[in-house]
């Protein structure tokens, strides 16, 4: 089949923009650390890079292959407020490179970590 | 309490970077439109802007207040392959402005649309 060059160019552009790579995301700190429901952070979210985007097949998953750590200071507030905000220092995993990996490999990796 | 200026500056920066605003995201086309499991798109994902980020309170939700529509041409593949990829033109919602809205208001809004 012969396809319009414009269509092919725009499709190629979409592939590039949606590929598996580190992307700036907002992380909800409370959810990330699963803290008690009366513990809040200000700001509630931080910006870090995490692997994201799409892989070319259903059986693949976008996973980090290398990670750096970013240190950020936030305020922690516990309610009822018996004292003011307390500073907490958090080291956030920041994905620096990513790869589309087989979901089976990812599953094996996780389970070998558990079994180790 | 007296806090270090550097800490306050970095916290302010985090607030700005994580605020509720349109953000470039990857949308899985098949999931977005809930197509049949034997229908695939190439590329499987497209890049659009959707509201995201954090609001200052648990009771608020980052919601779109205006939307434009982007037309994108992709290839649709149906298996078993009786024919080659077919170009399809899909219109995607692209959020152009956002606001932190009360979850109650969002709920009311959704339910008033349903009831109409």
């Amino acid at each position: 089949a012969h396809y319009n060059t414009e269509i092919l160019k725009s499709i190629d552009n979409e592939w590039r923009k949606t590929q598996c790579m580190p992307r700036e995301v907002c992380i909800d700190v409370g959810k990330e650390f699963g803290v008690a429901t009366n513990t809040f952070f200000k700001p509630p979210c931080v910006s870090v890079y995490r692997c994201g985007g799409c892989c070319n097949s259903e059986g693949l998953q976008c996973m980090n292959t290398s990670t750096s750590y970013l240190s950020k200071t936030l305020f922690e507030i516990t309610v009822p407020l018996s004292q003011g905000p307390k500073p907490v220092t958090i080291s956030f995993a920041n994905h620096t490179s990513c790869r589309c990996m087989s979901k089976l490999d990812v599953y094996r990796q996780v389970h070998s970590i558990i079994r180790r | 309490a007296h806090y270090n200026t550097e800490i306050l500056k970095s916290i302010d920066n985090e607030w700005r970077k994580t605020q509720c605003m349109p953000r470039e995201v990857c949308i899985d086309v098949g999931k977005e439109f809930g197509v049949a499991t034997n229908t695939f798109f190439k590329p499987p994902c497209v890049s659009v802007y959707r509201c995201g980020g954090c609001c200052n309170s648990e009771g608020l939700q980052c919601m779109n207040t205006s939307t434009s529509y982007l037309s994108k041409t992709l290839f649709e593949i149906t298996v078993p392959l009786s024919q080659g990829p077919k170009p399809v033109t899909i219109s995607f919602a692209n959020h152009t402005s956002c606001r932190c809205m009360s979850k109650l208001d969002v709920y009311r809004q959704v339910h008033s649309i349903i009831r109409r």
Epitope: E32, F33, G34, A36, T37, T67, Y69, I90, A93, I114 | -
Partner: nanobody
């Protein structure tokens, strides 16, 4: 259902060290976010340290540089190494875990007493 059992608390002199352990039952341990809270008599429970499955760590500024959180996924155990202990670290230390499934939930241990006194 996840069960958590803390151990390692006790009486220690100021400047001393203790290592708290939190053993978890259940599978998928490495996928949990986990951490430690403490509660001193008449005070509110406060967050001490936490860690995620992705390797992020959190420390309250009052313990930063003195306490270290770590986990051994092969033993399903979370640790809190506490050095240079002070009288103000006296509290009951609680381990928690957070399962981020379809129904997110916190699970808590029964606590272990740490007393710092000369």
């Amino acid at each position: 259902e996840v069960q958590l059992v803390e151990s390692g608390g006790g009486l220690v002199q100021p400047g001393g060290s203790l290592r708290l352990s939190c053993a978890a039952s259940g599978s998928m341990f490495s996928m949990y976010a986990m951490g430690w809270y403490r509660q001193a008599p008449g005070k509110q429970r406060e967050l001490v340290a936490a860690t995620t499955s992705g390797g992020s760590t959190l420390y309250a500024d009052s313990v930063k540089g003195r306490f270290t959180i770590s986990r051994d996924n092969s033993k399903n155990t979370l640790y809190l190494q506490m050095n240079s202990l002070r009288a103000e670290d006296t509290a009951v230390y609680y381990c928690y875990t957070y399962w981020r499934g379809s129904d997110p939930e916190n699970y808590w241990g029964q606590g272990t007493q740490v007393t710092v006194s000369s």
